[in-house]
Each structure stands twice: as structure tokens, then as C-alpha cells.
């Protein structure tokens, strides 16, 4: 089996001109492509992987919401030669981009890492943004976390920082098959320089006091750790059909955002080079973009995610 191979970390790693092919090893019978797009109120970016996969052919699309950070995940696996270039990895252009002057800052100030490398998202290096409220949601907390995508034996991880609705969340996360967006929230100006070691203690919650064990011996009960492994294999054509909601994300259980997935097949690779006169669009991340007035729904099976803000 021969598959396309590329890795995209909010750059052009999977854009058309950088496409590679790779011969899969024995026993490998699927090509895979996975894309995860993340959107903050100040912009969006995507990570993607193409290569030789494992599991069964099929599709899996999922929309996720972590305290106002939106994520959209797509996995596509197929069993023909070089079939893994159907997802559109291009983030939709904004028209006009960067129109944040239309939003009233709410006083909160956070570091923002949208498509920045780990080196550029250290401590107080990244840009500072003013938070604003969008679509009836209040964004007064700051977030520091990571998005991780694992597919085709490759793991891609990028930092995510920005404004969120929650001010106290600790090591919260949302997941899809081989996809995770996780991190912590905080309150206060530029508080999200580094929340990796944030504990579950909060000013509002008294610390847990550990009592000494009883002196009388008792039979010990060992708690069983149930470890669950996430497979990157997609179930056959399972698509989360979900619609946008304005419900506030729960502190304790981040939920799947309802998002309607509208998907068309991309242009066939064996057909014309352009696929019906439009750009083939099979690949290429446009760095990152502000989403202040993004298109509402994706076209051409894209990895775009619906905007919360916008006119």
C-alpha cells in the first residue's frame, strides 16, 4: 500500500507542494489522515497527519468545546493507494480578518498562542490579547494547555493559550480518537504564562486535610486503575451530528459542542488536477487566522469550525 505522508503543525507541512508518498510496511492496509483544528476568540489553527495507519477504513468527525475553546477533529482511513488526501486542511480565509475593534474588551488580558511553536509560546514571550465577550458568552479567564494529535504512528502537539469562559478549571480536557485538547484556566491579568503545575486547590475551596490512618489493622482494598487506550482507528462512518449551542461549559465535565457537520467529498484524485475549477484544497494550512467574522459552516469537508463571535 502507498500513502501520502506529511505532518502539519500550524504551518504548511501538509500543503500541496510538500506532499510526499510512502510505501507502507507489511500488514498495513489503511492510509490515514487526521486533522484537528482549534479556535480561540483570537484565531484558529490546525494540526494534521497523513501516513500509513492501522485499523479499519471509515470516518470520524467530532466537534468539541472546552470552556469556549472550540475544537474540530476529523479522521479518515481508507484502503486504496494514496487515498488519504480527502480532508481539506486549509483554514477558511476571513473577510475581513482581524476585525477585533468591533468587540468591547471586558478587562481580562491573557497570553495568546494560536499556531505558535512551543519555543515561541514560552512564559511571557507570546503576544498579549484583550479578552471580549462573544455570542452571549463571557470570556474572562485565561487558558494554558496543549492540543495533541496522534495518527499514523506520529504525535503532533502544539501549545494553546487564550481567553476562555472558565477562570478556575484545572487539567480539563476534551478528546476524540487520537485527539486531545487539554489544559488549565486561571483568573487575573496574564495569569496563563505557565499553568502546567496548577493543582486542584482553589482560593474558594479549602485544602483537603489528610487524617492519620486508624491504629487498628484492617484488610486493605486496592483500587483498580482502569487504563483506557485511545485507538486512532475510526469506526466505519461514524459522524457526530451536532449543532451549535450557547450553553456554558460545565466546570466538571467539558462536553461535546453541538456542531452540524456538513461534508462533501473532495475532488477525486484521479480526476482533473484541479477538481472542478476550484483549488483542490487538499492540504495546506494558512498559518493561523483571526476568527472575528468567520464563515459559519465548513465547505468541502473542511476542518473549519463555526465561529462564536462574528457579525
Amino acid at each position: 500500500l502507498e500513502c501520502y505522508s506529511c505532518v502539519q503543525k500550524a504551518d504548511d507541512g501538509c500543503s500541496p507542494h510538500r506532499m510526499k508518498t510512502v510505501k507502507c510496511g507489511p500488514g498495513v492496509d489503511v492510509c490515514t489522515e487526521a486533522v484537528g483544528a482549534v479556535e480561540t476568540i483570537h484565531g484558529q489553527f490546525s494540526v494534521a497527519v497523513r501516513g500509513c495507519g492501522s485499523g479499519i477504513p471509515g470516518k470520524n468527525d467530532r466537534g468539541l468545546d472546552l470552556h469556549g475553546l472550540l475544537a474540530f477533529f476529523q479522521l479518515q482511513q481508507c484502503s486504496e493507494d494514496r487515498c488519504n488526501a480527502k480532508l481539506n486542511l486549509t483554514l477558511r480565509g476571513l473577510n475581513p480578518a482581524g476585525n477585533e475593534s468591533a468587540y468591547e474588551p471586558n478587562g481580562a488580558e491573557c497570553y495568546s498562542c494560536v499556531g505558535l511553536s512551543r519555543e515561541k509560546c514560552q512564559g511571557s514571550m507570546p503576544p498579549v490579547v484583550n479578552c471580549y465577550n462573544a455570542s452571549g458568552r463571557v470570556y474572562k479567564g485565561c487558558f494554558d494547555g496543549n492540543v495533541t494529535l496522534t495518527a499514523a504512528n506520529v504525535t503532533v502537539s502544539l501549545p494553546v493559550r487564550g481567553c476562555v469562559q472558565d477562570e478556575t478549571c484545572t487539567r480539563d480536557g476534551v478528546t476524540g480518537p487520537g485527539f486531545t485538547l487539554s489544559g488549565s484556566c486561571c483568573q487575573g491579568p496574564r495569569c496563563n504564562a505557565d499553568l502546567r503545575n496548577k493543582t486542584y486547590f482553589s482560593p474558594r475551596i479549602p485544602p483537603l486535610v489528610l487524617l492519620p490512618p486508624p491504629t487498628t489493622a484492617a484488610p486493605s482494598t486496592r483500587a483498580q486503575n482502569s487504563s483506557s487506550t485511545t485507538s486512532t482507528a475510526a469506526p466505519t462512518t461514524t459522524t457526530s451530528i451536532i449543532k451549535p449551542t450557547t450553553a456554558q461549559a460545565s466546570h466538571t465535565s467539558p462536553h461535546e459542542m453541538d456542531l452540524e457537520v456538513i461534508q462533501e467529498e473532495g475532488a477525486s484524485l484521479s480526476g482533473g488536477a484541479a477538481g472542478h475549477g476550484g483549488t483542490a484544497g487538499h492540504g495546506g494550512a494558512a498559518g493561523h487566522q483571526d476568527r472575528s467574522n468567520m464563515e459559519k459552516y465548513p465547505g468541502k469537508g473542511g476542518a473549519q469550525i463555526p465561529a462564536k463571535g462574528g457579525s
Epitope: 505522508s5 504551518d11 504548511d12 500543503s15 500541496p16 507542494h17 510538500r18 506532499m19 510526499k20 508518498t21 510512502v22 494514496r82 488526501a85 486549509t90 483554514l91 477558511r92 480565509g93 473577510n95 480578518a97 475532488a267 484524485l269 488536477a273 484541479a274 477538481g275 475549477g277 476550484g278 483549488t279 483542490a280 484544497g281 487538499h282 495546506g284 494550512a285 494558512a286 498559518g287 493561523h288 487566522q289
Partner: antibody, heavy 117, light 112 residues
């Protein structure tokens, strides 16, 4: 029908500047990676520069780095190439090309740039 | 000196099969990057002939075929016709140069 129409070529002295334009139609320009490719008289094709759909990612050939600037205006469906500090070896027909499935699937007819004293 | 190496010329008679080679290195074709072929008829702009190593855009006759192996690629034209007389260029991405690279071009002459 996809169309790419270059303009702005002409005669210029060494050290001078020119700005080439490429008007695009028949496809969603704002979704397309675009490129400039040139061909000196009687010679082969030479890639000059790439620009991503949003304009955030740009590449240049070593031969033009620091002298040429590629840009785009998605609201006008137009690609640009600002050429400064022109040299005799920059004399060529300049083509704008759209990137489709991994390749330059549509090309303009080209505009001739002549650098001579 | 082009990064991708092609023979400067090739020729054949009508009906014959002609092959044009394109040799690269470990930073372009050998790195796994896909290869494309362009045809440039005299006095016209280049036209995409083969993309993604061996795929034909709609409208390109199946007389044209492409293949790739290791650090080289080749374009084969069977049932040669007089209208195939043109310059042919191969192209790929190059990791080291961080850009697209072309072969020097092969001038195909149809004899007789």
C-alpha cells in the same frame, strides 16, 4: 473557467523596480496557494516564490530573496510581485501559477520583464 | 545547473515510444516528494501534463504516463505524434532549498 492574467512587465534599468500583478478569476482565489515562476529567454523554468492562501506563509528562491516580495489581495483576487534592485539576470517572462493537487495546474500567459541599461 | 537533471533533448518518429528521465537527490525526489511534469509548446505557457508522479489531469491523453522510483522519475510518451513536439519539464519540492525545483527541460523532436 480558470483564468490568470499577468501585467506590469516592461523595460527597466538595473537597480530599478517593477510591480507585477496577476488577476485571477474562475475559482476561489482566497483558498488557493499561488506562485510566480519565470523563464529567461531560451532557458528553462525557474520557480520564484510561493504564497499561502491567507498570505501568512511565504517562500522565495535564493536568487530573489531580499529583493522580491510576493503578496496578495484576496478581496481583489489579485497576486503581486514587487521586484526591487533588478539585475540583468532577472530578465524573463514571469508567469503566475495556481497550485492545485500538488502541482501548478493553471498558468497565466506571462509578462515579459527586461532589465537592461 | 538545475537541481533536477533531464536530458537536454530527445527524439522519435511518429508512433514510437519515447521516455524522458528526471534525476533528483535525497532532498527532493528521494525524500518522497511527488513529481510533476509540464509540457510547453513553442510560444505558449507551460501546461500540467502529469501530477502526483503518475496521474493525468482531465484532457491529457493516456499516451502520456509517469513513474517514479528512488531518486528519479520518468515520463513516457507512446504513439508519438507531431503535436507532441515541445519542451518537457519535471518538478518537485526540495527540502534543502525550501522551494520548488524544476528540471532543465527536455526538447522533444518528432522526426519525419
Amino acid at each position: 473557467e480558470v483564468q490568470l492574467l499577468e501585467s506590469g512587465g516592461g523595460l527597466v534599468q538595473p537597480g530599478g523596480s517593477l510591480r507585477l500583478s496577476c488577476a485571477a478569476s474562475g475559482f476561489t482565489f482566497s483558498n488557493a496557494w499561488m506562485s510566480w515562476v519565470r523563464q529567461a529567454p531560451g532557458k528553462g523554468l525557474e520557480w520564484v516564490s510561493y504564497i499561502s492562501s491567507s498570505g501568512s506563509t511565504i517562500y522565495y528562491a535564493d536568487s530573489v530573496k531580499g529583493r522580491f516580495t510576493i503578496s496578495r489581495d484576496n478581496s481583489k483576487n489579485t497576486l503581486y510581485l514587487q521586484m526591487n534592485s533588478l539585475r540583468a539576470e532577472d530578465t524573463a517572462v514571469y508567469y503566475c501559477a495556481r497550485e492545485g493537487l500538488w502541482a501548478f495546474d493553471y498558468w497565466g500567459q506571462g509578462t515579459l520583464v527586461t532589465v537592461t541599461s | 545547473q538545475s537541481v533536477l537533471t533531464q536530458p537536454p533533448s530527445a527524439s522519435g518518429t511518429p508512433g514510437q515510444r519515447v521516455t524522458i528521465s528526471c534525476t533528483g537527490s535525497s532532498s527532493n525526489i528521494g525524500a518522497g516528494y511527488v513529481v510533476h511534469w509540464y509540457q510547453q509548446l513553442p510560444g505558449t505557457a507551460p501546461k500540467l501534463l502529469i501530477y502526483d508522479n503518475n496521474k493525468r489531469p482531465s484532457g491529457v491523453p493516456d499516451r502520456f504516463s509517469g513513474s517514479k522510483s528512488g531518486t528519479s522519475a520518468s515520463l513516457a510518451i507512446s504513439g508519438l505524434r507531431s503535436e507532441d513536439e515541445a519542451d518537457y519539464y519535471c518538478a518537485a519540492w526540495d527540502d534543502r532549498l525550501n522551494g520548488a525545483v524544476f528540471g532543465g527541460g527536455t526538447k522533444l523532436t518528432v522526426l519525419g
